[in-house]
């Protein structure tokens, strides 16, 4: 057995705090103003101890950050006080009022358009690198909800064929940078990210240039929380994967919830002979399970000395009051078959039920 | 080979300042969460703060509150303590930290380095 | 917060001893604990996580068990290498992550 996995089912569903309350307000600040979130007593009955969190941390008071039983003031907000907001029992943690604040200076816009931009013959016989459609990248700003795909597209044309790099904040900006990867479309003069979470935020500038000169383009990506929504998952590359017979496999999800989401690894498996239960629903064994405390959580699954029973498609799923996530990871298992393999254990380890 | 190099440590004086880093090698650094902990001369070991993979989500311990800040940058494969306001009682070895998943072990940790507070 | 407590606080015990040190939860953290051992003047190092499961390297004399609350880590004979200072650690609940107060395992 190995870091990530267990054999039996150990969730705490019994002791995560009372339901969440199902709406979120959703609120848009201007950079400058003064944030005030009010959280009046359920019912109007007594309201106890409570605690303001931002992001899962508790906010400590500050001449800035002005906290009281009922009411939370942050003076002269900036971006960085964007996020989701909670008032919470001391005692129980159970969330009684819950906001998604927004500080913005500048107004947001829809998503990106569609369409390619091949690169071009121009006929010059040199020269510096030129935009070749800039009425498409008026669009500075993009403001897409979570989730979604992104492109920035730079189409751009010179002679030489001038190359194209994308920067993050400045800084290169390579696949690794993001669980879910990039796609790099150098034809197209493209960069795309699929399933875009609040850390994809930030400038994103390219970089298009030849031996005669250098040319760039910076788009502010922000990416809305929409709220309430089931969890939002991003499989960690490669999600599907091949493996020889004794080695060691780790595949990695990461989950985005507001709400406290429910994870499990799961394997689908045979029960005799049969893939389904009568319903219909998938036979699954739970590898791994618990309540995540955080709105963010890398989950990993590690399969050591595999064998060729350890293939088949394995399921990061995660769940909250709102709905459910899954990503599927697929794992192939070939090589020389090891004597003491024959040997086929009784029982499939874990829990196994039609998930 | 997975390593966690930790520096910035040294002698400071009650109420100063140091930024301890620690380089990271070995692994895909953005797609893991890490922590700081300290072990006190003698004493056992404490943990001290936590940030997620993506650097969204931080935690500090009571101790620690409101003077530290944790940061990391996945373009230079580091992490970061900035500690502030610094007293005696944070005389310590601080290690840097690899956490395994959301719900698992410190799996690798950093050789330490000694920050002493002391006029 | 979950408060971890390792008995005993230190332990003498010779070469081919078989060892055990104790560790509660002081609420149910299912499978989430972890060991580690600690040298003097090193960092310490990942034994065993989720209650029983061996880290990579760690020899098989080193075993853990337990669930819930009470946790139990062995060494089924004890080599000159493994004198040293062992910590408990839970992950269930976080923040914070919280320690045993360690068991100094010294030769008799």
């Known amino acids: 057995e190995s870091l990530g996995t267990e054999q039996r089912v150990v969730g705490r569903a019994a002791e995560v705090p009372g339901p969440e309350p199902g709406q979120q307000e959703q609120l848009v600040f201007g950079s400058g103003d003064a944030v005030e979130l009010s959280c009046p007593p359920p019912g109007g009955g007594p309201m106890g101890p409570t605690v303001w969190v931002k992001d899962g941390t508790g906010l400590v008071p500050s001449e800035r950050v002005l906290v009281g039983p009922q009411r939370l003031q942050v003076l002269n907000a900036s971006h960085e006080d964007s996020g989701a907001y909670s008032c919470r029992q001391r005692l129980t943690q159970r969330v009684l009022c819950h906001f998604s604040v927004r500080v913005t200076d500048a107004p947001s816009s829809g998503d990106d358009e569609d369409g390619e931009d091949e690169a071009e013959d121009t006929g010059v016989d040199t020269g510096a690198p030129y935009w070749t459609r800039p009425e498409r990248m008026d669009k500075k700003l993009l403001a897409v909800p979570a989730a979604n795909t992104v492109r920035f597209r730079c189409p751009a044309a010179g002679n030489p064929t001038p190359s194209i790099s994308w920067l993050k904040n400045g800084r290169e900006f390579r696949g690794e940078h993001r669980i879910g990867g990039i796609k790099l479309r150098h034809q197209q003069w493209s960069l795309v990210m699929e399933s875009v979470v609040p850390s994809d935020r930030g400038n994103y500038t390219c970089v298009v240039e030849n031996k005669f000169g250098s040319i760039r383009q910076t788009y502010t990506l922000d990416v809305l929380e929409r709220s309430p929504h089931r969890p939002i998952l991003q499989a960690g590359l490669p999600a599907n994967q091949t493996a020889v017979l004794g080695s060691d496999v780790e595949f990695h999800c990461k989950v985005y919830s507001d709400a406290q989401p429910h994870i499990q690894w799961l394997k689908h498996v045979e029960v005799n002979g049969s893939k389904v239960g009568p319903d219909g629903t998938p036979y699954v064994t739970v590898l791994k399970s618990w309540i995540s405390e955080s709105v963010e959580a890398d989950v990993r699954l590690r399969l050591a000395n595999v064998s060729e029973r350890d293939g088949g498609e394995y399921l990061c799923r995660a769940t909250n009051f709102i709905g459910v996530a899954e990503k599927a990871f697929w794992l192939s298992v070939h090589g020389p078959r090891a004597a003491e393999e024959e040997l086929v254990e009784a029982d499939e380890a874990g829990s196994v039920y039609a998930g | 080979e997975v390593q966690l190099v930790e520096s910035g440590g040294g002698l400071v004086q009650p109420g100063g300042s140091l930024r301890l880093s620690c380089i990271v090698s070995?692994?895909?650094?953005?797609?893991?969460?890490m922590s700081w902990l300290r072990q006190a001369p003698g004493k056992g070991l404490e943990w001290i703060s936590y940030?997620?993979?993506?650097?969204?989500?931080?935690y500090y311990a009571d101790s620690v509150k409101g003077r530290f800040t944790i940061s990391r940058d996945s373009a230079k494969n580091s992490l970061y303590l900035e500690m502030n306001s610094l007293r005696a009682e944070d005389t310590a070895i601080y290690y840097c930290?690899?956490?395994?998943?959301?719900?698992?072990?410190?799996?690798?940790w950093g050789q330490g380095t000694l920050v002493t507070v002391s006029s | 917060d979950i408060q971890m407590t390792q008995s005993p606080s230190s332990l003498s015990a010779s070469v081919g001893d078989r060892v055990t040190i104790t560790c509660r939860a002081s609420q149910s953290i299912s499978s989430y604990l972890n060991w580690y051992q600690q040298k003097p003047g090193k960092a310490p190092k990942l034994l065993i996580y989720?209650?029983?499961s061996l880290q990579s390297g760690v020899p098989s004399r080193f075993s853990g068990s337990g669930s819930g609350t009470d946790f139990t880590l062995t060494i089924s004979s004890l080599q000159p290498e493994d004198f040293a200072t062992y910590y408990c650690q839970q992950s269930y609940s976080t923040p914070p992550i919280t320690f045993g107060q360690g068991t100094r395992l010294e030769i008799k």
């Open positions: 070995g692994f895909i650094f953005s797609s893991y969460e």
């Open positions: 940030i997620s993979s993506s650097g969204r989500v931080i």
């Open positions: 930290t690899r956490k395994w998943d959301s719900s698992g072990p410190f799996d690798f």
């Open positions: 989720a209650a029983s």
